[in-house]
Interface confidence: medium
């Protein structure tokens, strides 16, 4: 179980740093994603682990950014920002959509309402229950 | 209403240990990050220990190996076990919440409970 | 680690009061600001740096992004003389301490 686990991480990690940046291998990208929806949770172990994927990256203010499957739908009151950009993207997500190209890669600013915590807290307990 | 009272706090001697409690009323721990900060007489606010939703932990620097922050969903109480307690932890012990999205802040905090480490 | 100044301030009613704090790296705009008073629990004034929190006075006002910060109390009142506190919210991961060392505002 703990080779699963670091197994697990290695991917995770990787799929990461490599998000977005080839629009034909998006697979284990939408399946982290769909994670990061159904737990609540964003990155491995905090949300600043997408701080360094590159395609992400804006400029200045904007140098800080994550994918749409971090936001917390419950704790937010802006209907522009869900409407034109969250919505859509995790309604993909929702019904397991395959058809996300780099073009369409929705991220929002970390500013925004986005979970708290990473992801490998959660997995682990999903790993120990299965 | 939302409420957090702690308990659990005293006197005790140097090396000893102690629990507090935060008994939580209103809301749901499991959903939400909760933190336990202190503060010494006379002093300024000093984080000790955070509870994610998922279970997962962290504490400053100084309070890893000697407190453990945990909870009891079924009660909805949060505790902190402190062992090898030193005087420089004479303090009032506060336990807050934090939610679950990142950015959110302390509010509502308990009333705080003092804890005395003296011989 | 998040540094406040001043630690003392001392002004009077009516007086315009700006406390500072600074962040050792880039926060975001994840810092809250706090009152406390003597023998009180902290009482939560800001969040997401200028967010004021439910119930509390226009007259404060949170700025700053990254790793400056600024709270107002545009006209001071006689029941804002108290400790006020800042606190990040980026990260809690190897960390002594999320809070500034605070600032006292007095009567002068």
């Known amino acids: 179980r703990a080779q699963l686990e670091r197994s697990l991480r290695d991917v995770v990690e990787k799929t990461i740093q490599k998000y977005g940046t080839n629009p034909e291998e998006t697979a284990a990208e939408e399946s982290w994603d769909y994670v990061q929806f159904q737990l609540r949770c964003c990155g491995w172990h905090y949300p600043q682990d997408w701080f360094q994927v590159l395609i992400l990256r804006g400029n200045g203010s904007e140098a800080h950014r994550v994918p749409c499957s971090c936001y917390n739908l419950s704790a937010t009151n802006d209907s522009t920002i869900l409407d034109k950009v969250i919505l859509p993207q995790l309604s993909r997500l929702g019904h397991l959509a395959r058809s996300r190209h780099s073009a369409d890669i929705c991220a929002v600013p970390a500013e925004s309402h986005i979970y708290r915590e990473g992801c490998a807290q959660g997995l682990q307990k999903w790993l120990h229950n299965n | 209403e939302v409420q957090l009272v702690e308990s659990g706090g005293g006197l005790v001697q140097p090396g000893g240990s102690l629990r507090l409690s935060c008994a939580a009323s209103?809301?749901?721990?499991?959903?939400?990050?909760m933190n336990w900060v202190r503060q010494a007489p006379g002093k300024g606010l000093e984080w000790v220990s955070i509870?994610?939703?998922?279970?997962?932990?962290d504490y400053a620097s100084w309070a890893k190996g000697r407190f453990t922050i945990s909870r009891d969903n079924s009660k909805n109480t949060l505790y902190l076990q402190m062992n090898s307690l030193r005087a420089e932890d004479t303090a009032v012990y506060y336990c807050?919440?934090?939610?679950?999205?990142?950015?959110?802040?302390?509010?509502?905090w308990g009333q705080g409970t003092l804890v005395t480490v003296s011989s | 680690d998040m540094t406040q100044s001043p630690s003392t301030l001392s002004a009077s009613v009516g007086d315009r009061v700006t406390i500072t704090c600074q962040a050792s790296q880039n926060i975001i705009d994840y810092l809250a600001w706090y009152q406390q008073k003597p023998g009180k629990a902290p009482k939560l004034l800001i969040h997401?740096?200028?967010t004021l929190a439910s119930g509390v006075p226009s007259r404060f006002k949170g700025s700053g992004s990254g790793t400056e910060f600024t709270l107002t109390i545009s006209s001071l009142q006689p029941d804002d003389f108290a400790t006020y506190y800042c606190?990040?919210?980026?990260?809690?991961?190897?960390?002594?301490?999320?809070f500034g060392g605070g600032t006292k505002v007095e009567i002068k």
């Open positions: 209103g809301f749901s721990l499991s959903y939400n990050a």
């Open positions: 509870i994610f939703a998922s279970g997962r932990t």
């Open positions: 807050a919440r934090e939610g679950s999205t990142w950015g959110d802040a302390l509010d509502p």
């Open positions: 606190q990040q919210g980026y990260s809690n991961s190897n960390i002594d301490n999320t």
């Open positions: 997401k740096a200028s």
